[in-house]
C-alpha cells in the first residue's frame, strides 16, 4: 500500500469479534464486529464476504452489490426495499445479509 | 471463464462505434468490468468502470467521449465520436480489490479518413 | 490527478535479480498492482494489494511498498520474463473513482 497509518493499514479492516448462532433449523444467523482504518470517502462494509472499506456512495445508496459482497462464482441481488442482499451459490443455496 | 471483446473494426473519423465485451462462466453482478485500451507502440489506459448496479466512472479525459453500459452478460463500450487518436486495442477486464485478474484478447480499432 | 511514474526500460541478466519500481507523484491510499503483459497478448495480472500474488503466478515475482513508491521484484530472471510491466493503483473514491496505470517498463532479459 503507498500509504500506511497507525497499526491498521489505511483501507484494510480486521475482525474483533464472531457470533453464530445456529440454534433455528436450517438457519444460522452469524454476527460479526471489524475494526476499519477506512480512507477519506470510504465507510465499513463488505467485500468477498469480508470486512472491507468500501466507497461511502455505496451505503448511501444502498446499492450493497456494488461493493462485490458474495464470494467468487455467487450471484448478489438486493434485497426488495434494499434492505441488504443475497448471494447466491452456482447450487442454488441463498445466503442473506440485511443491513441494520 | 472467459472475456471476448467484439466489434472491432475500421471507422471514419466521427462515426459512433460500439464494441462489446461478452462474459462466460462467471455472474457480472459479481464483479467490477473495465475497458483498457492500448494504442499501437503505447502503454494501457484506462477507460472506464461499470459496478453490478450500473454505475458508471470514466477517466477524467474520457468524459463525454466514451460510454458503458451493461446488460447480463455483456458489456458495452461506445466510441461517440472517434478521432485517429482513438486507434487502439480495447480490452475488457474483470476486476474486484484484488485488481484486474481476467482480461479479453483485445479488439483493434482503427480510425482513419 | 495520480501520476505514475516507471523507467522506460530495464535490462537484467538471465538468472540475476531485478527491481521494478513505480513512484506516485502524490501520496495514494490504495493499494499497488502489478501486471505482465508480453506482445500481442493481453495483460495478466501479477501482484495484487501491494505484495499478493494470485494463484498460477511464480513465487519469482514479488511485491513490496514503502511510502509513495511500490517495488516489483523479479527473482532469478528467464527469458521468459523479457515483457512490458505496468504498474496500476485506484485514485479516489465516489464520484472521482479513477484506475491509473503507469507508462510501463520494458523488462529485457540478456
Known amino acids: 500500500q503507498f500509504l500506511k497509518e497507525g497499526q491498521l493499514a489505511a483501507g484494510t479492516c480486521e475482525v474483533i469479534a464472531a457470533h453464530r448462532d445456529s440454534s433455528q433449523p436450517r438457519r444460522t444467523i452469524a454476527r460479526q464486529t471489524a475494526r476499519c482504518a477506512c480512507r477519506k470517502g470510504q465507510i465499513a462494509g463488505t467485500t468477498r464476504a469480508r470486512p472491507a472499506c468500501v466507497d461511502a456512495r455505496i451505503i448511501k445508496t444502498k446499492q450493497w452489490c456494488d461493493m462485490l459482497p458474495c464470494l467468487e462464482g455467487e450471484g448478489c441481488d438486493l434485497l426488495i426495499n434494499r434492505s441488504g442482499w443475497t448471494c447466491t451459490q452456482p447450487g442454488g443455496r441463498i445466503k442473506t445479509t440485511t443491513v441494520s | 471463464q472467459s472475456l471476448e471483446e467484439s466489434g472491432g473494426r475500421l471507422v471514419t473519423p466521427g462515426t459512433p462505434l460500439t464494441l462489446t465485451c461478452t462474459a462466460s462462466?462467471?455472474?457480472?453482478?459479481?464483479?467490477?468490468m473495465s475497458w483498457v485500451r492500448q494504442a499501437p507502440g503505447k502503454g494501457l489506459e484506462w477507460i472506464g468502470i461499470v459496478y453490478p448496479s450500473g454505475t458508471t466512472y470514466y477517466a477524467n479525459w474520457a468524459k463525454g467521449r466514451f460510454t458503458i453500459s451493461t446488460a447480463s452478460t455483456t458489456v458495452d463500450l461506445m466510441i461517440t465520436s472517434p478521432t485517429t487518436e482513438d486507434t487502439a486495442t480495447y480490452f475488457c477486464a474483470r476486476g474486484d480489490s484484488f485488481g484486474y485478474g481476467l482480461w479479453g484478447p483485445g479488439t483493434l480499432v482503427t480510425v482513419s479518413s | 490527478e495520480l501520476v505514475l511514474t516507471q523507467s522506460p526500460s530495464v535490462q537484467v541478466n538471465l538468472g540475476q535479480t531485478v527491481s521494478l519500481t513505480c513512484t506516485a507523484d502524490?501520496?495514494?491510499?490504495?493499494?499497488a498492482s502489478w501486471y505482465q503483459q508480453k506482445p500481442g497478448q493481453a495483460p495478466v495480472l501479477l501482484i495484487y494489494?501491494?505484495?499478493s500474488r494470485p494463484s498460477g503466478v511464480p513465487d519469482r515475482f514479488s511485491g513490496s511498498s514503502s511510502g509513495n513508491t511500490a517495488t516489483l521484484t523479479i527473482s532469478g530472471a528467464q527469458a521468459g520474463d523479457e515483457a512490458d510491466y505496468y504498474c496500476?493503483?485506484?485514485?479516489?473514491?465516489?464520484?472521482?473513482?479513477?484506475?491509473?496505470f503507469g507508462g510501463g517498463t520494458q523488462l529485457t532479459v540478456t
Open positions: 496500476a493503483t485506484s485514485d479516489g473514491s465516489g464520484s472521482n473513482y479513477q484506475y491509473v
Open positions: 502524490t501520496l495514494s491510499r490504495s493499494y
Open positions: 462462466g462467471f455472474s457480472l453482478s459479481t464483479y467490477y
Open positions: 494489494r501491494d505484495t
